[in-house]
């Protein structure tokens, strides 16, 4: 049975600033055919037929749901892209994470400007501070890492705060063993 294809992002953030670039790639098993990919944005078929969809100089209209399909195989699960205009943007490797998987958070400055005195907050409480910009990199996420995160920092000597982001860590499905 052919597997569903999967959409991946490069860079891996599904929240980006207006004007930035991102490439969506449709990964699947044994898809070697040229021009065999269908891309759907908010349900509408895109003109792109390559296995990669390049979004250059992102606009607000590029926000929304993306799915891909190889030949007659099932559509991929949707990926949601959101385009922002702000001073700070909290980016996450994933917003729903399986327990035991890594979780990476980044406090991204508009136009890649330097951000200083960055603080990450979780559920309203300061979580991590450093003099300059820095990341949070959790190797093995646990359910306790679930919560609402945001970051604050200084850009050009002024204080800014990102929009909040909900992160959910879900328990890995347990294998079922039947007694013989």
């Amino acid at each position: 049975v052919p597997q569903k294809p999967k959409v991946s992002l490069n860079p891996p953030w599904n929240r980006i600033f207006k004007g930035e670039n991102v490439t969506l790639t449709c990964n699947g098993n044994n898809f070697f055919e040229v021009s065999s990919t269908k891309w759907f944005h908010n349900g509408s078929l895109s003109e792109e037929t390559n296995s990669s969809l390049n979004i250059v100089n992102a606009k607000f209209e590029d926000s929304g749901e993306y799915k891909c399909q190889h030949q007659q195989v099932n559509e991929s699960e949707p990926v949601y892209l959101e385009v922002f205009s702000d001073w700070l943007l909290l980016q996450a490797s994933a917003e729903v994470v399986m327990e035991g998987q890594p979780l990476f958070l980044r406090c991204h400055g508009w136009r890649n400007w330097d951000v200083y005195k960055v603080i990450y907050y979780k559920d309203g409480e300061a979580l991590k501070y450093w003099y300059e910009n820095h990341n949070i990199s959790i190797t093995n996420a646990t359910v306790e890492d679930s919560g609402t995160y945001y970051c604050t920092g200084k850009v050009w000597q002024l204080d800014y705060e990102s929009e909040p982001l909900n992160i959910t860590v879900i328990k890995a499905p347990r294998e079922k063993y039947w007694l013989q």
Partner: antibody, heavy 120, light 112 residues
């Protein structure tokens, strides 16, 4: 109130590794960097490194890069420093210390220190 | 690494006198974020160090106002306006601006 509890002393054979503990209480353990500082007998203070319990990010003094490993156990609010292949030069008091980088200081609360003696 | 050089190594004073300790860094410790993370600690015999001054000139709460810090760039000074018996011990300057963070070698304040 904030407390950092450390064992009083550890005797270790040269070449054997030693793991020092620092149990924190009275504050949100995952929200502050934990530092390790040592002091050889009759000498000054030396910063070894720091670890952030939220994600175990570590910043180490290059002098200790190959010999000190900093870890945390969030469930017990305990920070650890493992010193591998110690020599007599490593005999010292080892402190854990917590400050508030946001407010601009690194060491406000100190453990009582663990006296490590490296001796055959 | 940034080297912190303290002077003098020993400072004999009479109670009630003013004491002044100098600390020089081998390069500027003004961080690119605009702050200078220069701290002063006092360690009494058999005790852990105690924070006195942070970010060059900010007195930590509960620290008597006879303690003051000043300086910028690479030159810093701790002044004690009227030395009291409880002030005796070893004073350390410390830079927390750039990793690896470094302490000065210490200044022992003792009775003349």
């Amino acid at each position: 109130q904030v407390q950092l509890q450390q064992p009083g002393a550890e005797l270790v054979r040269p070449g054997a590794s030693v793991k020092l503990s620092c149990k924190a209480s009275g504050y949100s353990f995952t929200s502050y960097w934990m530092n390790w500082v040592n002091q050889r007998p009759g000498q000054g203070l030396e910063w070894i490194g720091m670890i952030h319990p939220s994600d175990s990010e570590t910043r180490l003094n290059p002098n200790f890069k190959d010999r000190a490993t900093l870890t945390v156990d969030k469930s017990s609010s305990t920070a650890y420093m493992q010193l591998s292949s110690p020599t007599s030069e490593d005999s010292a008091v080892y402190y854990c210390a917590r400050g508030s980088l946001y407010d601009g200081y690194l060491f406000l609360y100190w453990g009582q220190g663990t006296l490590v003696t490296v001796s055959a | 690494d940034i080297v912190m050089t303290q002077s003098p190594l020993s400072l004999p004073v009479s109670l009630g006198d003013q004491a002044s300790i100098s600390c020089r860094s081998s390069q500027s410790i003004l961080h690119s974020n605009g702050d200078t993370y220069l701290e002063w600690y006092l360690q009494k015999p058999g005790q852990s160090p105690k924070l006195l001054i942070y970010k060059v000139s900010n007195r930590f709460s509960g620290v008597p106002d006879r303690f003051s810090g000043s300086g910028s760039g690479t030159d810093f000074t701790l002044k004690i306006s009227r030395v009291e018996a409880e002030d005796l011990g070893v004073y350390y300057c410390f830079q927390g601006s750039y990793v690896p963070f470094t302490f000065g070698s210490g200044t022992k304040l003792e009775i003349k």
